[in-house]
Interface confidence: medium
């Protein structure tokens, strides 16, 4: 495979509801019809897989039913949304793109998006 450039934003702030969205864009050197996108989380020196989806170009991304990720694709861009985030999930989220079909196989790994998650302040009890 040839190296493939993957671009993603450096920093994203999650919403107060624990939702973070970012775009993962890849410069496809081939005419891929089948693409696999994986979101990896790097914390300290540990890298874990957050979610992954395989899709046909022009079709929707399909994550597993219990996945915390959703996404849409448009050309060489994938719009990824990660839900259910809490402060402890703050970290570097890396977009990995693989062009699976047709051969040759291409692999691209982004530099990562630092997602900051701030847990909302609990509402003060109101006395009536």
């Amino acid at each position: 495979c040839k190296a493939m450039h993957v671009a993603q934003p450096a920093v994203v702030l999650a919403s107060s509801r624990g939702i973070a969205s970012f775009v993962c864009e890849y410069a496809s050197p081939g005419k891929a019809t089948e693409v696999r996108v994986t979101v990896l989380r790097q914390a300290d020196s540990q890298v874990t897989e957050v979610c992954a989806a395989t899709y046909m170009m022009g079709n929707e991304l399909t994550f597993l039913d219990d996945s915390i990720c959703t996404g849409t694709s448009s050309g060489n861009q994938v719009n990824l949304t990660i839900q259910g985030l809490r402060a402890m999930d703050t970290g570097l989220y890396i977009c990995k793109v693989e062009l699976m079909y047709p051969p040759p196989y291409y692999l691209g790994i982004g530099n990562g998006t630092q997602i900051y998650v701030i847990d909302p302040e609990p509402c003060p009890d109101s006395d009536f």
């Epitope: 495979c1 040839k2 992954a52 395989t54 046909m56 699976m100 079909y101 196989y105």
Partner: antibody, heavy 115, light 111 residues
Framework: QVQLVQSGAEVKKPGASVKVSCKAS????????FTWVRQAPGQGLEWMGW????????DYAQKFEGRVTMTTDTSTTTAYMELRGLKSDDTAMYYC????????WGQGTTVTVSS | QSVLTQPPSVSGAPGQRVTISCTGS?????????VHWYQQLPGTAPKLLIY???SRPSGVPDRFSGSKSGTSPSLAISGLQSEDEADYYC???????????FGSGTKVTVL
């Protein structure tokens, strides 16, 4: 853990066909395709082709085009490679491997072609 | 005859460093396609050792390293151990054959 288990050894006559199976477990089957590679006795590795488990698309090495068929069965998470018109120089160990990157391999299936 | 050429054999004493080259042409390595390396221990299936020229899958010791300087990829094994005795193959895409091609293979012997 991720595992690929292949069918047992086969002995075939010249002109016959052989169908090798590769049962996958430990990962989402449709997320990765299968590469098939063979190795003649005492020789190097030879790429035969690739199949997508996602939609069944195939890409075969020119050498095997018209003689090989690769398929997958999502219901049983199994990949198959059928080679027709066997000749003595098809005697080899046949391997399946996960994905085009071949990050996990089956244990191999010995196919002997002899009259 | 393989499209990618490797030395038939290399050897070294335990603890030494050995390198294996993989030479291709303008339709494969020279065209910029990545090189992957596989290790095949005697009597076993091959195992992915290095992908994308220099990346190591988890579980592969850091004694193994891949590099690609221009059009000359190589695999290095430092701190050679007896369990490294195996055949090593490089792999790249060839755009004229429209197929993946393996190198001829290199047998590593630990003296």
């Amino acid at each position: 853990q991720v595992q690929l288990v292949q069918s047992g050894a086969e002995v075939k006559k010249p002109g016959a066909s052989v169908k090798v199976s590769c049962k996958a477990s430990g990962y989402i089957f449709t997320s990765y395709g299968f590469t098939w590679v063979r190795q003649a006795p005492g020789q190097g590795l030879e790429w035969m082709g690739w199949i997508s488990s996602y939609n069944g698309n195939t890409d075969y090495a020119q050498k095997f085009e018209g003689r090989v068929t690769m398929t997958t069965d999502t219901s049983t998470t199994t990949a198959y490679m059928e080679l027709r018109g066997l000749k003595s120089d098809d005697t080899a160990m046949y391997y399946c491997a996960r994905g085009p990157q071949m990050d996990v391999w089956g244990q191999g299936t010995t196919v002997t072609v002899s009259s | 005859q393989s499209v990618l050429t490797q030395p038939p054999s290399v050897s070294g004493a335990p603890g030494q460093r050995v390198t294996i080259s993989c030479t291709g042409s303008s339709s494969n390595i020279g065209a910029g396609y990545d090189v992957h390396w596989y290790q095949q221990l005697p009597g076993t299936a091959p195992k992915l050792l290095i992908y994308g020229n220099s990346s190591r899958p988890s579980g592969v010791p850091d004694r193994f390293s891949g590099s690609k300087s221009g059009t000359s990829p190589s695999l290095a094994i430092s701190g050679l151990q007896s369990e490294d005795e195996a055949d090593y193959y490089c792999l790249s895409w060839d755009e004229s054959l429209n197929a993946y091609v393996f190198g001829s293979g290199t047998k590593v012997t630990v003296l």
